[in-house]
């Protein structure tokens, strides 16, 4: 879902709040990707984005082992990476970034969370000299309230994204449970 000819510019980080007093241990566990917005995300109505899940596991060195599970090509696909604590609690960078060809920077910022229900996380990366950003709306369950979805839409729009760059992935029966 990557339409990269004219990318919407990434917002200044001053427009992206940071969750105060971030509790890394409470953020652990499975999060469903209930909402997804970004400059390389495009809503496709005929074949909608399917929901995936991301599991955060805290390691002894306080970095996260991050595993996403997706349904792809009729099977479950696992994508594993490490998020290393950044300058302030709730900020992370990508571990072992040199092993990702073309990737020169990667920032993760937890915008807001109540840990047991929902979270919004901002991602920004530079790949092949192009700057990409996305925001995920995480839920501990596959469904979140309309109020949370509307807040996610408002926040995404405040970062310059139009509605066709904001999607709510469809919850599916395969891979993401269990």
């Amino acid at each position: 879902q990557d339409s990269t000819s004219d990318l919407i510019p990434a917002p200044p980080l001053s427009k992206v709040p940071l969750q105060q007093n971030f509790q890394d241990n409470q953020f652990q566990g499975k999060w469903y990707v209930v909402g997804l917005a970004g400059n390389a995300i495009l809503r496709e109505d005929k074949d909608p984005q399917k929901m995936y899940a991301t599991i955060y596991e805290l390691k002894e060195d306080k970095s996260y082992n991050v595993t996403s599970v997706l349904f792809r090509k009729k099977k479950c696909d696992y994508w594993i990476r490490t998020f290393v604590p950044g300058c302030q609690p709730g900020e992370f960078t990508l571990g072992n970034i040199k092993s990702y060809p073309g990737l020169t920077s990667y920032l993760v910022r937890v915008v807001s969370t109540n840990y047991n229900q929902h979270a919004m996380v901002f991602f920004k990366k530079v790949s092949q000299n192009r700057e990409y950003f996305k925001i995920t709306l995480y839920g501990r369950t596959k469904e979140l309230t309309s109020e949370l979805k509307e807040n996610f839409i408002r926040f995404s729009k405040s970062l310059g994204l139009p509605e066709n760059h904001i999607v709510f992935p469809v919850p599916i029966d395969q891979c993401i449970d269990g």
């Epitope: 005929k46 074949d47 399917k50 349904f71 309309s146 979805k149 509307e150 919850p171 599916i172």
Partner: antibody, heavy 116, light 107 residues
Framework: VQLQESGPDLVAPSQSLSITCTVS????????VHWVRQPPGKGLEWLIV???????TSNSALKSRLSISKDNSKSQVFLKVNSLQSDDTAIYYC???????????WGQGTSVTVSS | DIVMTQTPATLSVTPGDSVSLSCRAS??????LHWYQQRSHESPRLLIK???QSISGIPSRFSGSGSGTDFTLTINSVETEDFGMYFC?????????FGAGTKLELK
């Protein structure tokens, strides 16, 4: 674009129902197919959708009793409903997925009665 | 699940009348609301998507409005072929749910 359901008229309680939806004018590898039912004289109830990539989304209230599969080459989608009771008596429709999670083309429906 | 409530249950009209059908959601669904027509012994037909967006091939006398929890389908100058059931459907939250319908009948 056409969709056609086929299945039994009568099923005994506690038995299983199998219905086939045969489509033409579009490819199941490009479009999702929904199943919706309508009890006699009542409204519509959404059951399940088979997406083009083979993933499914189902109504959690019925999830344990529903199964769905498809054969892209034969342009057919198969719905199975287990442990039928009298309140499963309905017209069962298949419908093509359209943007914004609507259904733009519907089959004519197949009427199923659950009775001994 | 989101509950969709349609009013009135039955609407008796004369051809040429203009009518409004109401659909209310149990919580905000933004504009994720769609309308279908079902004539007697026929399959449902999509009339309006996303509260107010028209569908190709549907006569312009059908229009939709609303957002949040309250929605309206308006039929300007009802024709005899318009009689039947009208259902609203939400797609803001899974499972997809329909209203119980409004029956448009001849007075």
């Amino acid at each position: 674009v056409q969709l056609q359901e086929s299945g039994p008229d009568l099923v005994a309680p506690s038995q299983s129902l199998s219905i086939t939806c045969t489509v033409s004018g579009f490819s199941l590898s490009s479009y999702g197919v929904h199943w919706v039912r309508q009890p006699p004289g009542k409204g519509l109830e959404w059951l399940i959708v088979m997406w083009s990539d083979g993933s499914t989304t189902s109504n959690s209230a019925l999830k344990s009793r529903l199964s769905i599969s498809k054969d892209n080459s034969k342009s057919q989608v198969f719905l199975k409903v287990n442990s039928l009771q009298s309140d499963d008596t309905a017209i069962y429709y298949c419908a093509r997925h359209y943007g914004y999670f609507t259904m733009d083309y519907w089959g004519q429906g197949t009427s199923v009665t659950v009775s001994s | 699940d989101i509950v969709m409530t349609q009013t009135p249950a039955t609407l008796s009209v004369t051809p040429g009348d203009s009518v409004s059908l109401s659909c209310r959601a149990s919580q905000s669904i933004i504009t994720d609301l769609h309308w279908y027509q079902q004539r007697s012994h026929e399959s449902p037909r999509l009339l309006i998507k996303s509260a107010s967006q028209s569908i190709s091939g549907i006569p312009s006398r059908f229009s939709g409005s609303g957002s949040g929890t309250d929605f309206t389908l308006t039929i300007n100058s009802v024709e005899t072929e318009d009689f039947g059931m009208y259902f609203c459907q939400q797609s803001n939250s899974w499972p997809l749910t329909f209203g119980a319908g409004t029956k448009l009948e001849l007075k």
